[in-house]
């Protein structure tokens, strides 16, 4: 469960996250499992550890192997394993299966291809996109932040899409490429104004001080693949990332589910070690798509730990 496959190409940057998570204040030690040799943290090294991240700048085929990360806190240690494989660059245009990230699908009205793993890197626009080694050009293709949108998708748009970007580390630039398949579904979908299923409007959630708490923001957006649908949390009207409380984090990525045939998304807000001041905050679940934005507000209240339910 706490082992993760990662792969990359030689002479490209590769950044791997420890499969075990911890607070930013926890120290993370990395080791090369075969030799139990510690990975240095000095950035002058080609391979170095930076907290939860292991950086290969650039990667070499010889770097392949299993790496151990240990998240250390004052009260516990958690161990994870990163199985890293670095491949030689292909001379032809074919991307082998072992270099492919998960397949995504789209339909005539809705198509969005995320660039895999890009969130781990320090990249700046432009993000370049290729299909079968050809740079994508024309008004049908739009690069939005970390994803590609294809307008008026046709069956011919199915294929392997590669994103290419530059990772910057202390002024040095490294190339990164990632490829995933895109399939086109012929479906009669529709899109609705977002409907938030959870939390209930003005919900009061009972939490215990000192314990962890999870809040789930869940909304449905229509039938079929949804274009630019998202759910997220705000704290006192501020994005979680801007609020600056490391104990309170949004889950990475959004989980997609289907409820009665409707396409739904949910985002979990994790509050570690709930404190008194967390009860004073306002938690807003936002659901948005092309039609508009909806929000539901949650507040926390203290749960009496001696409450007994028959």
């Amino acid at each position: 469960k706490f082992s993760k496959q990662s792969w990359g190409l030689e002479n490209e940057a590769l950044i791997v996250r420890c499969p075990r998570q911890g607070k930013p204040s926890y120290t993370v030690d990395w080791y090369y499992s075969q030799t139990n040799k510690s990975i240095p943290t000095q950035e002058r090294n080609r391979v170095f550890a930076s907290g939860q991240l292991l950086k290969f700048l650039p990667a070499a085929v010889a770097d392949s192997g299993i790496y151990t990360c240990i998240v250390r806190s004052p009260t516990f240690n958690r161990t994870g394993y990163a199985n890293v494989t670095i491949y030689k660059k292909q001379s032809d245009c074919n991307v082998p299966d072992y270099l492919m990230y998960s397949t995504v699908s789209g339909s005539e009205k809705n198509s969005k291809i995320y660039c895999p793993t890009i969130d781990l890197y320090n990249w700046t626009a432009p993000l370049e996109w290729f299909k079968n080694c050809q740079a994508l050009q024309g008004s049908r293709y739009r690069a939005h932040k970390s994803f590609l949108v294809i307008d008026n998708v046709m069956t011919e748009d199915a294929g392997d899409y590669t994103c290419k970007f530059i990772h910057n580390e202390n002024g040095a630039n490294y190339s990164v490429t990632a490829t995933r398949s895109f399939t086109v579904k012929d479906e009669q979908g529709f899109s609705l104004f977002p409907v938030i299923g959870a939390p209930a409007q003005n919900e009061i959630k009972e939490v215990e001080i000192g314990k962890n708490a999870n809040l789930t923001c869940s909304a449905c957006f229509g039938k079929g693949t949804q274009f630019l649908a998202a759910v997220l949390w705000q704290l006192n009207g501020t994005k979680i990332t801007d609020f600056g409380e490391p104990r309170i984090q949004q889950e990475e990525g959004q989980n997609q589910s289907f409820s009665n045939g409707l396409a739904c998304l949910d985002m979990v807000l994790r509050i570690a070690d709930v404190k008194e001041e967390d009860l004073l905050l306002q938690y807003d679940c936002l659901a948005l798509n092309l039609h508009g934005l909806r929000r539901h507000t949650v507040r926390l209240s203290r749960k009496n730990p001696i409450d007994h339910h028959s």
Epitope: H144, L232, G237, K239, D242, L290, G292, R294, R295, T297
Partner: antibody, heavy 120, light 107 residues
Amino acid sequence: EVQLLESGGGLVQPGGSLRLSCAASGFTFSNSDMNWVRQAPGKGLEWVSFISSSSGYTYYADSVKGRFTISRDNSKNTLYLQMNSLRAEDTAVYYCARANNNWNFYFDYWGQGTLVTVSS
Amino acid sequence: DIQMTQSPSSLSASVGDRVTITCRASQSINNWLAWYQQKPGKAPKLLIYSASSLQSGVPSRFSGSGSGTDFTLTISSLQPEDFATYYCQQSYDTPITFGQGTKVEIK
């Protein structure tokens, strides 16, 4: 100092088109959600349109949906409003306004406005 | 759509008076409410956001309160420069809607 400067207003006939621009300076435009708000002569404020910082999301008031298009060019720090099929009831001062936070529709900075008159 | 209703539509007051303007939303908007001041020929100015947070640079005689559907803007001691029209606005969901405005005139 934050500045928003609208331009492109003027007199146009019903059914005509106009493109408004709003030049922004003094803040990180590419990180800011932006809006257009209008005010008919002697009337109250009416929100017209919204665009997210990355241009991914655009929202419109029902009264302009299908006729107006909001867009932005982050490399030029400029917000646009393309107005087609204009009607007499679109006559108003059009303001561009910055939202004070992503996904918060509180408008903390406004331009001075540009007057659009739709008349034959 | 959420309707915002302000009252009164206009009021006359003297310098030094305590002035209260109310705003009612057609459904609960929690505290997602802003107040703006607008003077003739000028752009609106943000006074209060999140129902009760004072925007930077706004004098402390302005205050906001309320949650849910009923909100109040209070000017504790009216100054000559406060004669203007005031608007409430909900930012709870789209479409964004404003109240019809309250004009504060000199008595």
